[in-house]
Amino acid sequence: KFSKQSWGLENEALIVRCPRQGKSSYIVDWYYSQTNKSIPTQERNRVFASGQLLKFLPAEVADSGIYTCIVRSPTFNRTGYANVTIYKKQPDCNVPDYLMYSTVSGSEKNSKIYCPTIDLYNWTAPLEWFKNCQALQGSRYKAHKSFLVIDNVMTDDAGDYTCKFIHNENGANYSVTATRSFTVKDEQGFSLFPVIRAPAHNETKEVEIGENTNLTCSACFGKGAQFLATVQWQLNGNKITDFSEPRIQQEEGQNQSFSNGLACVNTVLRIADVKEEDLLLRYDCLALNLHGLRRHTIRLSRKHHHHHH
């Protein structure tokens, strides 16, 4: 439960987060699990600990192993494990399965490919993107923030996409690459004014205070691949990103699904540890394409049930 798998390439930066969460003020100690030797915090070391993060700048194959992190609050020590594997750089262009992050699927018109793990690093735009080791060039490819946008996607755009960026640590630069597969669904079709499948307009969802809940915003935009089709959540008419409540997050990226030939997109709003004040918010599912915008509102209410003691 408190162990996390991480991997990287030799001579690249690798940053790993302790799987035990705590307050930012908590002290986190890192150890080599095999020797119980403490990992230094001084940044002059190639491998050093920095709070919740363990940094390999750069990584070596010999760094592979299990690392122990101990999150020390004033009252408890909580232990987690990071299982790190550093691989040798491949001589050819082939990226083995064990170096691949999760596969993403896209539509034929417009797709996003997110660069995995990038949020752990101190990087500056733009990202470099490669497909099957070839640098991507042309106006169809747009490196935007932490993702790649491909316009007018075609079936032969499927393949392995690698993002490359520079991590900066105290003025020193380190390269990082991460690869994931991209698949394309090939369909011809048409677009319609968005139809929101979920939630129903003015729906009320019963939730347990203190529990986690997910709200799915799902809409269909026509048949086949769509040029512009987006769904998103708003809270009281504001973007999620403008609403400073870390418990409420919209999942990164959007799932494209094809239901009965229809192109449908959904995004999930995850609310952790539902609070009383969450019941006062208005949750708007917005679906937008070239035809226009449709909005469905959902509210949360407290689940009523009898207690047996």
Partner: antibody, heavy 117, light 106 residues
């Protein structure tokens, strides 16, 4: 040594509100979480909720949701638990306890609240 | 909701006995379980956290074991000061105490 000193016993009428304080010494209240636990006479322990005093985030057990408010004053290292709409079954000893997100390590001496008409 | 079933509710034993208290959950919570001791009129005292980690200052006759859904607190050789009520606490999802086990002198 970490000490948590709670305010004295209270007698309240049904429908009233009680506010109990918990002063922490030899410890910075911002550095950890503060929990509150109820224990009715002759009964077991019941977790009421917790606060992260550094940022004011609170979480409450469903049983007490809507009636309990946990606050903290970091300038005086004091936590507070307010329970409203009191009823006779709220007669209990209330404990504050400091710990991390998951558990309590140091406890106050307890405050007896009696709800009686 | 995670339910905790603590057993037995009452336990009579003698000084020197080995006793075991069990806490069973209705869902797998790995080792996010803690054990407390409470004496009459006193605040609870933490003995063991995360299944088997002994709190500093707690005698080594106390031990915790188990994972998943079944956890046990064992006192290897009862001492007079161990007669008290014991509670398990789960913190996998919010926090919930077990019903308690009152350990009495036989």
């Amino acid at each position: 040594e970490v000490q948590l000193v709670q305010s004295g016993a209270e007698v309240k009428k049904p429908g009233a509100t009680v506010k109990i304080s918990c002063k922490v010494s030899a410890f910075n209240i911002k550095d950890d979480y503060m929990h509150w636990v109820q224990q009715a006479p002759g009964k077991g322990l019941e977790w009421m909720g917790r606060i992260d005093p550094a940022i004011g985030n609170t979480e409450y057990a469903e049983k007490f949701q809507g009636r309990v408010t946990i606050t903290a004053d970091t300038s005086t290292d004091t936590a507070y638990m307010e329970l409203s709409s009191l009823r006779s079954e709220d007669t209990a000893v209330y404990y504050c306890a400091t710990g991390d997100f998951y558990a309590m390590a140091y406890w106050g001496q307890g405050t007896l609240v009696t709800v009686s008409s | 909701d995670i339910q905790l079933t603590q057993s037995p509710s009452f336990l009579s034993a003698s000084v020197g006995d080995r006793v075991t208290i069990t806490c069973i959950t209705n869902t797998d919570i790995d080792d996010v379980i803690h054990w407390y001791q409470q004496k009459p009129g006193k605040a609870p005292k933490l003995l063991i956290y995360e299944g088997n980690t002994l709190r500093p200052g707690v005698p080594s006759r106390f031990s915790g074991s188990g994972s998943g859904t079944e956890f046990t607190l064992t006192i290897s050789s009862l001492q007079p000061e161990d007669f008290a009520t014991y509670y398990c606490l789960q913190s996998d999802n919010m926090l919930t105490f077990g019903q308690g086990t009152k350990l009495e002198i036989k």
